[in-house]
């Protein structure tokens, strides 16, 4: 049953907690020789090729939480949260990137058209209007003489944790991969822990892969605390269901306040932010598996 958390029955392609709609890969590949192929080029953005009767289909199986943490997509649409954006990219097999946190409408408020050209997505977000979409955490510097995307990623505080990336280069920390991705404005993924070696297949490394199922899991720094339940922390009461979006809710008895113990890869007061600072991966054959 497609029941969103917190009640209110749902159904359909964007149903919270349900499976995303499947895309028939034969419709995406209009090649006479191999019409039914379902591969990395036809089933991207987190899609998984699955058998469907005679052929294969590209399934988008995203379990998205329903909290309203809106993001503005590069296509001009606002998404309920980042997971909804990723699911849409998979569903439509189009690249959609987050160009701004918050809705896409311009800053002149709600009501009667929201001050944007209806349906065009022309003025997606004022902050990015001159640069075009700045991807991979880059920001638009409109004051600069040569208007462009600038990267303000500071990797100075990260410890030595070398990784091999999809561009064939070794980086001293996953943060530097993000920085390179931001500067080059292209997708660079982490392939494995440790420096790249001669045995690494550079043709494979060079391939861009948006498949979330291969993406390494990440850990929130707060997960390194060795907190033990010593009578001070207890599970939160039922009325705080949903307080922690990606984590466990703990009720601190002494302060009578709730706090969140975030799952791997999330940070923020409600575990609502994605954090890519610390990486833990376990290589399994050629693919990376989540810890």
């Amino acid at each position: 049953s497609n029941q969103p958390p917190g009640g209110g029955g749902g159904s359909g392609g964007d149903c919270p907690g349900g499976k995303g709609k499947s895309i028939n890969c034969s419709e995406l590949n209009v090649r006479e020789s191999d019409v039914r192929v379902c591969d990395e080029s036809s089933c991207k953005y987190g899609g998984v090729c699955k058998e469907d009767g005679d052929g294969l289909k590209c399934a988008c199986q995203f379990q998205c939480h329903t909290n309203y943490i809106p993001v503005c997509g590069s296509n001009g649409d606002t998404y309920q949260n980042e997971c909804f954006l990723r699911r849409a990219a998979c569903k439509h097999q189009k690249e959609i990137t987050v160009i701004a946190r918050g809705p896409c409408y311009s800053d002149n408020g709600s009501g009667s058209g929201e001050g944007e050209e209806e349906g065009s997505g022309a003025e997606v977000h004022r902050k990015h209007s001159k640069c075009g979409p700045c991807k991979y955490k880059a920001e638009c510097d409109e004051d600069a003489e040569n208007v462009g995307c600038v990267c303000n990623i500071d990797c100075s505080g990260y410890s030595f944790n070398p990784v091999c990336a999809s561009d064939g280069s070794s980086y001293n920390n996953p943060c530097f991969v993000r920085e390179a991705s931001c500067i080059k404005q292209e997708q660079i993924d982490i392939r494995h822990l440790g420096h790249c070696t001669d045995t690494d297949d550079t043709s494979l490394l060079g391939k861009k892969d948006d498949g979330l199922q291969y993406r390494p899991d990440v850990k929130d720094a707060s997960d390194q605390r060795e907190d033990v339940y010593i009578g001070n922390h207890m599970p939160c009461p039922e009325n705080l269901n949903g307080y922690c979006i990606h984590g466990k809710c703990e009720f601190i008895y002494s302060t009578q306040k709730a706090s969140c113990r975030c799952e791997s890869g999330y940070t923020g007061q409600h575990c609502e932010k994605t954090d890519f600072s610390i990486l833990y991966v376990v290589p399994s054959r050629q693919k990376l598996t989540h810890v």
Epitope: G13, N67, D77, Y79, F84, C104, S110, G111, E114, E118
Partner: antibody, heavy 123, light 107 residues
Framework: EVQLLESGGGLVQPGGSLRLSCAAS????????MSWVRQAPGKGLEWVST????????YYADSVKGRFTISRDNSKNTLYLQMNSLRVEDTAIYYC????????????????WGQGTLVTVSS | EIVMTQSPATLSVSPGERATLSCRAS??????LAWYQQKPGQVPRLLIY???TRATGIPARFSGSGSGTEFTLTISSLQSEDFAVYYC?????????FGGGTKVEIK
């Protein structure tokens, strides 16, 4: 100017059916999720149902689940609410409302609201 | 579901005075809260969204504040046209829920 105009309300017996319509104009209808919100006489507001802009996702309040069906025809810029197995407690003014933000949004504020159509369920 | 509780149920204020309306959520809704005004025989009208952002055309005397579970709508100097019922609504998660309303009446 965004306009929403409801129709289809009226008097119906318990167990009966009604179909409400909401004609929309002044905005790109298919880009916005649309909702029905009701208000019983002298009471507060209650969210009833929401449908995504494309129409492929629908959401219902527990009180109407299994009895009401929300749908839309984007070619006609029209939102519908099919109400079956009506109960006395369904008596209310039914408002059609647009979400404030366009896109793949499933929760939002309502802006603007239609004038409403009165549904009376009585024997 | 998230229960929204408004207080007081009725607020008696003289024109020109300040009115403070409260809305409490049973669990955190971040800043995902809206306020509506409904005058007798009229449809609800959006005043505030995002807990503190005024909607288009709403006078500056209306202001919203708060986040998490405690929210406030303040009308700095009540005008005759402000006497109405005010509702809060959370849109943080399903199902969308409204408060019971606060009626602002002439003292």
């Amino acid at each position: 100017e965004v306009q929403l105009l409801e129709s289809g309300g009226g008097l119906v017996q318990p167990g009966g059916s009604l179909r409400l319509s909401c004609a929309a104009s002044g905005f790109t209808f298919s880009s916005y999720a649309m909702s029905w919100v009701r208000q019983a006489p002298g009471k507060g507001l209650e969210w009833v149902s929401t449908i995504s802009g494309s129409g492929d996702s629908t959401y219902y309040a527990d009180s109407v689940k299994g009895r009401f069906t929300i749908s839309r025809d984007n070619s006609k810029n029209t939102l519908y609410l099919q109400m079956n197995s009506l109960r006395v407690e369904d008596t209310a003014i039914y408002y059609c409302a647009k979400f404030g933000v366009r896109g793949v949004i499933i929760t939002n504020w309502f802006d603007p609201w239609g004038q409403g159509t009165l549904v009376t369920v009585s024997s | 579901e998230i229960v929204m509780t408004q207080s007081p149920a009725t607020l008696s204020v003289s024109p020109g005075e300040r009115a403070t309306l409260s809305c409490r959520a049973s669990q955190s809704v971040s800043s995902n809260l809206a306020w509506y005004q409904q005058k007798p025989g009229q449809v609800p009208r959006l005043l505030i969204y995002g807990a503190s952002t005024r909607a288009t055309g709403i006078p500056a005397r209306f202001s919203g504040s708060g986040s998490g579970t405690e929210f406030t709508l303040t009308i700095s100097s009540l005008q005759s046209e402000d006497f109405a019922v005010y509702y809060c609504q959370q849109y943080n998660n399903w199902p969308l829920t409204f408060g019971g309303g606060t009626k602002v009446e002439i003292k």
